[in-house]
Structures are given as C-alpha cells and as structure tokens.
C-alpha cells in the first residue's frame, strides 16, 4: 500500500513539475527590467527564452520573437536546448510511469516490469528535474553577470552632457517557476525510484511439500535446506538496475543586452 | 467614432476646489488610461497625471500631487479631475487626453477653461 | 525631469515651401528592448487641442497627410514639413513618451508669409 502511495505521489509531483517545466519555458517573463534606483519609465521590458516584450505604460504590448538562430548568444542557445531535454524526457517518463503504475492494470505485466519502468521514469524524471535546474541556473547567472556589468557602465563613461537610461535586468517570474518544478520533477524522480524497491517481489516461498518415505513419517520441507544445499526458494526475483552514466555540460554566463520601465 | 466630451468653463476664487469632467464614447472606456494635461495661457503643455479606469491605479506628475485628484466612474465612462485650493497660477485649459499606443494621447477633449480671479 | 528643446520657437514660410523644426531632449528616448524612440510630435491650431501627428519618432498617425515626416534617434529629433499648407499653421510640441514625468517641449509655431 505504502509502494503504491509513493508511487502515486511520485507521478503526481512529477506531473506537476514538467507542467511547471513546460510553463516556464514558453513563458517571456524570463528577464525583467530592474526598476530599482531607475528614472520611472512609461515603457517595461522583459524577455523569454523565445521572445521579447515591451509594456506600455499606455497599456499596450508589444512581443517580438528572436527570428534568427545563428545571431542568438550560444548560451541562450543551451538554455533553451536544457529546457527541452528537460521537457522531452519528461514527457517520456510520464508516458513510462503511467504503464508503471501499480493501480492500473494491463494484461499481465509483472511486477518485475513495472519495477523495471517505475526505475526508468524515475531515472527519467531525476535527469529532466536536473536539465531544467541547470538551465534556470544558467539563465540565472548570465543576468547577474549581465546586471553587475551594466551598473559598471551607469558610474563610468557619465562625462558628456546627455544622459542615457541604462536598462537593466533582473530574474523574471519564470525562473522561479523553472527552480520550482525542476525541484518537484526530481523529488518525483527520487520518489519513483524509492518505489521501484518496493514493487520489486523480495521472495516467493514455494509451499511445503510433503514427502513420505516407506515406513517414516517425515516431512521434509525443500525450503530447510536452503543455506546448505542451495534448493527451494532461496532465488529471489532481483535485479540489478544500471541507472546509466550522465553527464552534464559546463555552462557560463553569456552578456546579454536587457531592458526597464 | 471616439470623443472626449469636457465640461464646460468655470470661474472660481482663490482657495475654493473645482472638478472637472470628461465622458467618453465610442471606445472601451476601462480599456485605456485617460491623461490630464494643463495649458496655461499661450503657453505650453504640462502632464498632470492620468488613471487607469479599470483598476483606478492613478501615475501623477510630482508637481502636481496635493494638487490634483483623478477618479473615473465607470458606469458612466467618465473621468474627472479635482483641483484644491486654486491659486491664479492654476489659471489654464485643462485637457484630458486618451492614452493610445507608443505613451501617446491619442485623441484630446475639446478642453475646459478654469480661471481662478478674486 | 527631462527637458524637451525645440527650435525654432517660430517660423515663417511661404505655402509650398520645405520646413523643418528641431526637438532635442536631454535624456536619450531609445528603447534598447523595442529598438524604438519615444518621442511624439503634436499640432495645434489655434483655439484647438492637440491633434497627435507622430509617434515613435517616425510613425505617422492614421490619417496624417504623408507630408508630414518624423526623424531621428536618441536625443535629436526633426520634424519635416515638405509642402506646407495653410492648414498647417499651428504651434507644433514635441514630448518625451518614455520617462515619467511626460514632458512636452515649448513649442514651435508656424506662421505664413
């Protein structure tokens, strides 16, 4: 009862963080104009993975999508290629743990299978869980590097009588949606993987046999002799699981222009 | 076809209030922020401040904070602007102006003349 | 607050001539996000209100004759007139459309010969 419930969660919270992954992704407020120790502007910049965006103070938006990909910064480039990786090996790992559930039955599946595809989607959701973390992360530190730059530029090159509004940007709302489900995605995973143990049958104890020999009446059970003679029940129905090896690229900030209102 | 409708001229002494209004029509009233702009004689255009109908979220010019309030009511789509404690220096036309795409004011009432005189 | 400059605070023309009018503010109005300079130009003639005739520094309003120009980028703004007209005698206003407070320049007004 106890697997099931784990196994159920597991899924949930999974699902939950790869909608979470998925929302994060196509959402533009990945950027966002600082608007502290700034002149108050009538015009709010912010940025996504995809698009750019302007507010008007009037109320009008205006979104323009980033139609090239060559002239796109290389680490935007890893960020959205993380997100993906993320998204697809999550959806796959749904796909996978839905199968693997211990409260839906189909054909005659045994329990070694859905251990087997409970461990997999787990594996599958920890990796997506990772991808989306590192790539937040990374978007994260190309807009500090990016910020702490621009303030350099607001205190040097000020000797000329015009003045320029020096926009700079700050996390967006979409990156704590990023951290957030990423964070559930693999505590999912993790869950999966705990209940993968408990799907797995530990023993299968045959019943005693009764064998009688002319004259006696003994009764001899296989399973007695299990430690000397190697017979009876002492096979357990157990695997051996290779998660499989997974690497991650190193990743460094890129300086990426941003906008204020 | 989108009109600004102001009310008309007022005479009024130092230290006394006034408040003005300005009806819209033709357009969604709660879908854009109506502006208000001050013109004293001859001279120039000074931004008061505007406010959004829908939230009623007002943006007012430092200037004229403590001096001008703007409140909308929506079930007539019309804006007002009360002034206080008027001075001579608050002698002008005062417009309100629709605020259009790119923070501009798109279209303008016809403009109410306050003339402040003891 | 950023100051709008206009040039010249008058002119006089003859119908059918070329005029152009300056705008200088003393803060940049390009937007790096939208690549767009929030600078608006207005006419107003005598015993009227303001009637919007650019905005974006370049993009002309719906219904303005195509005489009717906007240039310029940063804080050097122009205003073109290629054939003026006798219906074009107003005082003309530049504003800032970027930074609060909105700013409006003094204006340059428009006479004929």
């Known amino acids: 009862m106890a697997v099931t419930a784990c196994q159920g969660l597991g899924f949930v919270v999974s699902l939950i963080g790869i909608a979470g992954i998925i929302a994060a992704t196509c959402m533009d407020q990945w950027s966002t104009q600082d608007l502290y120790n700034n002149p108050v502007t009538a015009v709010f910049n912010y940025q996504g993975l995809w698009r750019s965006c302007v507010r008007e103070s009037s109320g009008f938006t205006e979104c323009r999508g980033y139609f090239t990909l060559l002239g796109l910064p290389a680490m935007l480039q890893a960020v959205r290629a993380l997100m993906i990786v993320g998204i697809v090996l999550g959806a796959i790992g749904l796909l996978v743990s839905i199968f693997a559930l211990k409260c839906i039955r189909i054909g005659s599946m045994e329990d070694s299978a859905k251990a087997n595809m409970t461990l997999t989607s787990g594996i599958m959701f920890i990796v997506s869980g990772l991808c989306a973390i590192a790539g937040v992360s990374v978007f994260a530190n190309m807009l500090v590097t990016n910020f702490w730059m621009s303030t350099a530029n607001m205190y040097t090159g000020m000797g000329g009588m015009v003045q320029t509004v020096q926009t700079r940007y700050t996390f967006g709302a979409a990156l704590f949606v990023g951290w957030v489900a990423g964070g559930l995605t693999l505590i999912g995973g993790v869950m999966m993987c705990i209940a993968c143990r408990g799907l797995a049958p530990e023993e299968t104890n045959y019943k005693a046999v009764s064998y009688h020999a002319s004259g006696h009446s003994v009764a001899y059970k296989p399973g007695g002799f299990k430690a000397s003679t190697g017979f009876g029940s002492n096979t357990k129905n157990k695997k051996i699981y290779d998660g499989g090896a997974r690497t991650e690229d190193e990743v460094q900030s890129y300086p990426s222009k941003h906008d204020y209102v | 076809e989108v009109q600004l409708q102001q009310s008309g001229p007022e005479l009024e002494k130092p230290g006394a209030s006034v408040k003005i209004s300005c009806k819209a029509s033709?357009?969604?009233?709660?879908?854009?922020?109506m502006n208000w702009v001050k013109q004293s004689n001859g001279k120039s255009l000074e931004w008061i401040g505007n406010?959004?109908?829908?939230?009623?979220?007002?943006t007012y010019n430092q200037k004229f904070k403590g001096k001008a309030t703007l409140t909308v009511d929506k079930s007539s789509s019309t804006a007002y602007m009360q002034l206080k404690s008027l001075t001579s220096e608050d002698s002008a036309v005062y417009y309100c102006a629709r605020y259009g795409k790119g923070n501009t004011m798109d279209y303008w009432g016809q403009g109410t003349s306050v003339t402040v005189s003891s | 607050d950023i100051v709008m400059t206009q040039s010249p605070s008058s002119l006089t023309v003859t119908a059918g001539e070329k005029v152009t009018m300056s705008c200088k503010s003393s803060q940049s109005l390009l937007n790096s996000g939208n690549q767009k300079n929030y600078l608006t130009w207005y006419q107003q003639r005598p015993g009227q209100p303001p009637k919007l005739l650019i905005y974006w520094a370049s993009t002309r309003e719906s219904g303005v004759p195509v005489r009717f120009t906007g240039s310029g980028s940063g804080t050097d703004f122009t205003l073109t007139i290629s054939s003026v007209q006798a219906e074009d005698l107003a005082v003309y206003y530049c504003q800032n459309a970027y930074i609060y407070p909105l700013t409006f320049g003094t204006g340059t007004k428009l006479e004929l010969k």
């Open positions: 033709g357009y969604s009233f709660t879908g854009y922020k």
């Open positions: 406010i959004d109908p829908y939230y009623g979220g007002t």
